[in-house]
């Protein structure tokens, strides 16, 4: 297993609809054709595998398990979007990238993106 640098933004604020997007960029030492991306959430004394996708370079990312994530890839960048976030989902979201094929296997883990989620205030009742 060889190490690889992964960069991601330090902080992202989710939209009022509970959507947060960030870029995960990895310094690929070679020409990988198969890449696996996993997003981990670290907070509240728990670690959650939020979503994971394996993709062939140049193809769409396919997330399994009714995933709350969507994403696209462009070169050594992965554009990730996490949906359906609630205030209690605030935490550090870590991007983990694995170059699966061809060998050698490379692993890179980012420092994490702190995603802040604020639940929207309910609309006040209207008399009209």
């Amino acid at each position: 297993c060889k190490a690889m640098h992964v960069a991601q933004p330090a902080v992202v604020l989710a939209s009022s609809r509970g959507i947060a997007s960030f870029v995960c960029e990895y310094a690929s030492p070679g020409k990988a054709t198969e890449v696996r991306v996993t997003v981990l959430r670290q907070a509240d004394s728990q670690v959650t595998e939020v979503c994971a996708a394996t993709y062939m370079m140049g193809n769409e990312l396919t997330f399994l398990d009714d995933s709350i994530c969507t994403g696209t890839s462009s070169g050594n960048q992965v554009n990730l979007t996490i949906q359906g976030l609630r205030a209690m989902d605030t935490g550090l979201y870590i991007c983990k990238v694995e170059l699966m094929y061809p060998p050698p296997y490379y692993l890179g883990i980012g420092n994490g993106t702190q995603i802040y989620v604020i639940d929207p205030e309910p609309c006040p009742d209207s008399d009209f």
Partner: nanobody
Amino acid sequence: EVQLVESGGQLVQAGGSLRLSCAATGHTYNTYPLGWFRQAPGKEREFVAAISPSGTLRAYADSVKGRFTISRDNAKNTVYLQMNNLKPEDTAVYYCARHRSVGWRASHHLSDYDNWGQGTQVTVSS
């Protein structure tokens, strides 16, 4: 309505291993995340681990990560909790629960889960 029945709890020495099972009945079992929680005497019920509908994604409490492994067999409608290197502080009643919503979540909290089992007692002696 989904019913959950836990089994496998017993008295074990510190450093030992146990495997808990949670058998589910109900046709919606495969579409929901399932979780394990525990409650020690005089303490609140706390999150231990959770697993996504197909079993590809997992979540763990920091206190058990690296020691416990959650898995599920959808053909058998069963979720498992493999517990290794048990410690006296792991002593508790362990409960299986079904997530309220279909699909996976970024975090796991007591309020997210319903359809609780009756629990199985795990006692770790030093």
